[in-house]
């Protein structure tokens, strides 16, 4: 039995940022679980890590250095990232893994989610700093 | 005015375990992120976990992962950092920092620190 | 992760002078620099934030300025209370790290 996956086809990273939900075919409450979100054709880059474990904390980590973090539904998790880059736009897919309680559960390949990063120009000027930081 | 202020910090052995407290007012706690930074004797700082505003998610440095464990108890405005398995290298000063909602790793205001020496 | 190289370790200057110190990424980050002043005993001070803007309460004196892999903050008039340790601190990418840090000293 494979847990089925839905994503968006599409999102646009507005502000080089984008929140990414996968909605799986299972319910995670009081599982053990490994969702995460890889980037590209072949999914060689794992963006972002989200582990549960029974604790209402979930643990979130990238291997492969992006600025994430993490919500959990009864059936999904979503995925927030910050500091994209426009050359990371790319398809993503959304993984998910079950390990307890038994049997180990994972996921058939999800037709992924294309994000567009359109980011905003990044470029200070240090004669118009902004505004102040409270 | 913003103020935390970290407690909880002694001296303990190798292999043992201390429980950091820090208690935050003038601001609503709830709104921010949470975080600890270290700084070993003579060094530079270190960020070591951070835990979002509602508690829900946290993020530790690989050197802790396993070892040390953040929580927050929003109706007491206190921010906890649980050390486990302590080793020499974790001698430092712990403090806690906040961040707000949107930039998540940009540390506007910091305790005064709490400091943590591990040593037979 | 992104290591950040600050130099000079130590800066020997008067009061009055002007203060360059440098902060070196290993990969690009952007804007997303902060810079922090730390006294001997006290908690680290956000002085400088996405690189260029001043945080709440900072003296006009603090500037900061660079994108991508080199970021400079200038202290264009030393004052007594400015002799400290000076730290930058990238947000780009998971983890944050901090530079080793400069040491502003009274010559």
């Known amino acids: 039995n494979k847990i089925l996956v839905k994503q968006s086809p599409m999102l646009v990273a507005y502000d080089n940022a984008v929140n990414l939900s996968c909605k799986y075919s299972y319910n995670l409450f009081s599982r053990e679980f490994r969702a995460s979100l890889h980037k590209g054709l072949d999914s060689a880059v794992e963006v972002c890590v989200v582990y549960g474990n029974y604790s209402q904390q979930l643990q979130v980590y990238s291997k492969t250095g992006f600025n994430c973090d993490g919500k959990l539904g009864n059936e999904s998790v979503t995925f927030y990232l910050q500091n994209l880059y426009v050359n990371q736009t790319d398809i993503y897919f959304c993984k998910i893994e079950v390990m307890y309680p038994p049997p180990y559960l994972d996921n058939e390949k999800s037709n992924g989610t294309i994000i567009h990063v359109k980011g905003k120009h990044l470029c200070p000027s240090p004669l118009f700093p902004g505004p102040s930081k409270p | 005015e913003v103020q935390l202020v970290e407690s909880g910090g002694g001296l303990v052995q190798p292999g043992g375990s201390l429980r950091l407290s820090c208690a935050a007012s003038g601001f609503t706690f709830s709104d921010y992120w949470m975080h600890w930074v270290r700084q070993p004797p003579g060094k530079g700082l270190m960020w070591v976990s951070r835990?979002?505003?509602?508690?829900?998610?946290?993020s530790h440095a690989d050197s802790v992962r396993d070892r040390f464990s953040i929580s927050r108890d929003n109706a007491k405005n206190t921010l906890y950092l649980q050390l486990n398995g302590l080793r020499a290298e974790d001698t430092a000063v712990y403090y806690c920092a906040r961040a707000d909602n949107t930039t998540w790793y940009e540390f506007d205001f910091w305790g005064q620190g709490a400091l943590v020496t591990v040593s037979s | 992760e992104i290591v950040l190289t600050q130099s000079p370790a130590t800066l020997s200057l008067s009061p009055g002078e002007r203060a360059t110190l440098s902060c070196r990424a290993s990969?690009?980050?952007?804007?997303?620099l902060a810079w922090y002043q730390q006294k001997p005993g006290q908690a680290p001070r956000l002085l400088i934030f996405?690189?260029?803007k001043r945080a709440t309460g900072i003296p006009a004196r603090f500037s900061g300025s660079g994108s991508g892999t080199d970021f400079t903050l200038t202290i264009s008039s030393l004052e007594p209370e400015d002799f400290a340790v000076y730290s930058c601190q990238q947000r780009h990418n998971w983890p944050p790290t901090f530079g080793q840090g400069t040491k502003v000293e009274i010559k």
């Open positions: 990969q690009s980050i952007s804007i997303y």
């Open positions: 996405d690189a260029s």
């Open positions: 835990i979002n505003s509602d508690g829900s998610t946290a």
